[in-house]
């Protein structure tokens, strides 16, 4: 028969012959022959291959380096890589999460719109009229100005995006 020019799914063409790919978690030791199936071997400890493959070497699991602020979020298997995330208060600098940076704080006048996670930074927003933030924080939202009226007080000093209003007693009308 004519040698094949293309192979089925989960096969590869080598020297005019279709051989089975190695399953995830295994590496190629030797191509198949007319008489022998493809030789595959399981990946070793701390190694993985996540696809049907013909790789002769497994990939090393990612190392979550604590010196870079990283920790293991999900331990790798022979078929999956280790997933790293950042320590509390830090987030990844990239999608691959190869290093971490400290969460950004929102300056006075800005509040936290979205609290940072291990993979995303703090998102800040300017405090709108009626709200303020007087601290630099990675957690604090903009707070509403105090309502003097509900306390039976009057505004003595107007609020800003960085300061609360100052309430005071109402002037008593003299008889």
């Amino acid at each position: 028969p004519e040698p094949p020019t293309a192979c089925r799914e989960k096969q590869y063409l080598i020297n005019s012959q279709c051989c089975s790919l190695c399953q995830p978690g295994q590496k190629l030791v030797s191509d198949c022959t007319e008489f022998t199936e493809t030789e595959c071997l399981p990946c070793g400890e701390s190694e993985f291959l996540d696809t049907w493959n013909r790789e002769t070497h497994c990939h090393q699991h990612k190392y979550c380096d604590p010196n870079l602020g990283l920790r293991v979020q999900q331990k790798g298997t022979s078929e999956t890589d280790t997933i790293c995330t950042c320590e509390e208060g830090w987030h990844c600098t990239s999608e691959a999460c190869e290093s971490c940076v400290l969460h950004r704080s929102c300056s006075p006048g800005f509040g936290v719109k979205q609290i940072a996670t291990g993979v995303s930074d703090t998102i800040c927003e300017p405090c709108p009229v009626g709200f303020f933030s007087n601290v630099s924080s990675a957690f604090e939202k903009c707070h509403p100005w105090t309502s003097c009226e509900t306390k039976d007080l009057v505004v003595q000093q107007a609020g800003t995006n960085k300061t609360d209003v100052v309430c005071g007693p109402q002037d008593r009308l003299r008889a």
Epitope: N15, S30, D31, C32, T33, E34, F35, T36, E37, E39
Partner: antibody, heavy 117, light 109 residues
Framework: QVQLVESGGGVVQPGRSLRLSCAAS????????MHWVRQAPGKGLEWVAV????????YYADSVKGRFTISRDNSKNTLYLQMNSLRAEDTAVYYC??????????WGQGTMVTVSS | EIVLTQSPGTLSLSPGERATLSCQAS???????LAWYQQKPGQAPRLLIY???SRNNGIPDRFSGSGSGTDFTLTISRLEPEDFAVYYC??????????FGGGTKVEIK
């Protein structure tokens, strides 16, 4: 460890039959093709026969075609060579060997077959 | 059928010397499917080189294979006492039959 052990050799008269066995251990026998290779006293290596991993494909050297039959029992991890109508020129050490795309990577220690009247 | 011719038939050398063994094929060996085996007296052959130039697992790097098409060479860079043996080439690209060369005996001078 990976091992092949031949047995069944001996002295036999011309025209008679003999069955050689090759017991495999230490690897997944059912995934590998297997060969028989022989070596006459003081001579070189001569390939005899091959069988595919599942036993469907078999090839023979012209010198043994029609007289020798290669077979296997994967449930017993054993390869066989049925030798009929033996001749003096079949006298040799018979080796079984594992088939890979690297050649014959594992060999047994051999079993001696002597065809003599 | 591919016929393999090995030369020389015998090579007389001293330990430490370089050994060059030749294997010539009667027609081109596809995909360089050529192997070299070492055989010592009373022992089974041992696979040294496959694919004309790749060393098998555990084979010392003083053994090297080269060549393509019809001309192949096994080189032992510095002979050790345990290297004195018979060496066979074999093609496994065109079968049946899988053919062996006649062998080269490397003996102590």
């Amino acid at each position: 460890q990976v091992q092949l052990v031949e047995s069944g050799g001996g002295v036999v008269q011309p025209g008679r039959s003999l069955r050689l066995s090759c017991a495999a251990s230490g690897f997944t026998f059912e995934k590998y093709g297997m060969h028989w290779v022989r070596q006459a006293p003081g001579k070189g290596l001569e390939w005899v026969a091959v069988i595919s991993y599942e036993g469907t494909s078999k090839y023979y050297a012209d010198s043994v075609k029609g007289r020798f039959t290669i077979s296997r029992d994967n449930s017993k991890n054993t390869l066989y060579l049925q030798m009929n109508s033996l001749r003096a020129e079949d006298t040799a050490v018979y080796y079984c060997a594992r088939d890979t795309s690297r050649g014959h990577d594992i060999w047994g220690q051999g079993t001696m077959v002597t065809v003599s009247s | 059928e591919i016929v393999l011719t090995q030369s020389p038939g015998t090579l007389s050398l001293s330990p430490g010397e370089r050994a060059t063994l030749s294997c010539q094929a009667s027609q081109s060996v596809s995909y360089n499917y050529l192997a070299w085996y070492q055989q010592k007296p009373g022992q089974a052959p041992r696979l040294l080189i496959y694919g004309a130039s790749s060393r098998n697992n555990g084979i010392p790097d003083r053994f090297s294979g080269s060549g393509s098409g019809t001309d192949f060479t096994l080189t032992i860079s510095r002979l050790e006492p345990e290297d004195f043996a018979v060496y066979y080439c074999q093609q496994y690209s065109d079968y049946p039959p899988f053919t062996f060369g006649g062998g080269t005996k490397v003996e102590i001078k």
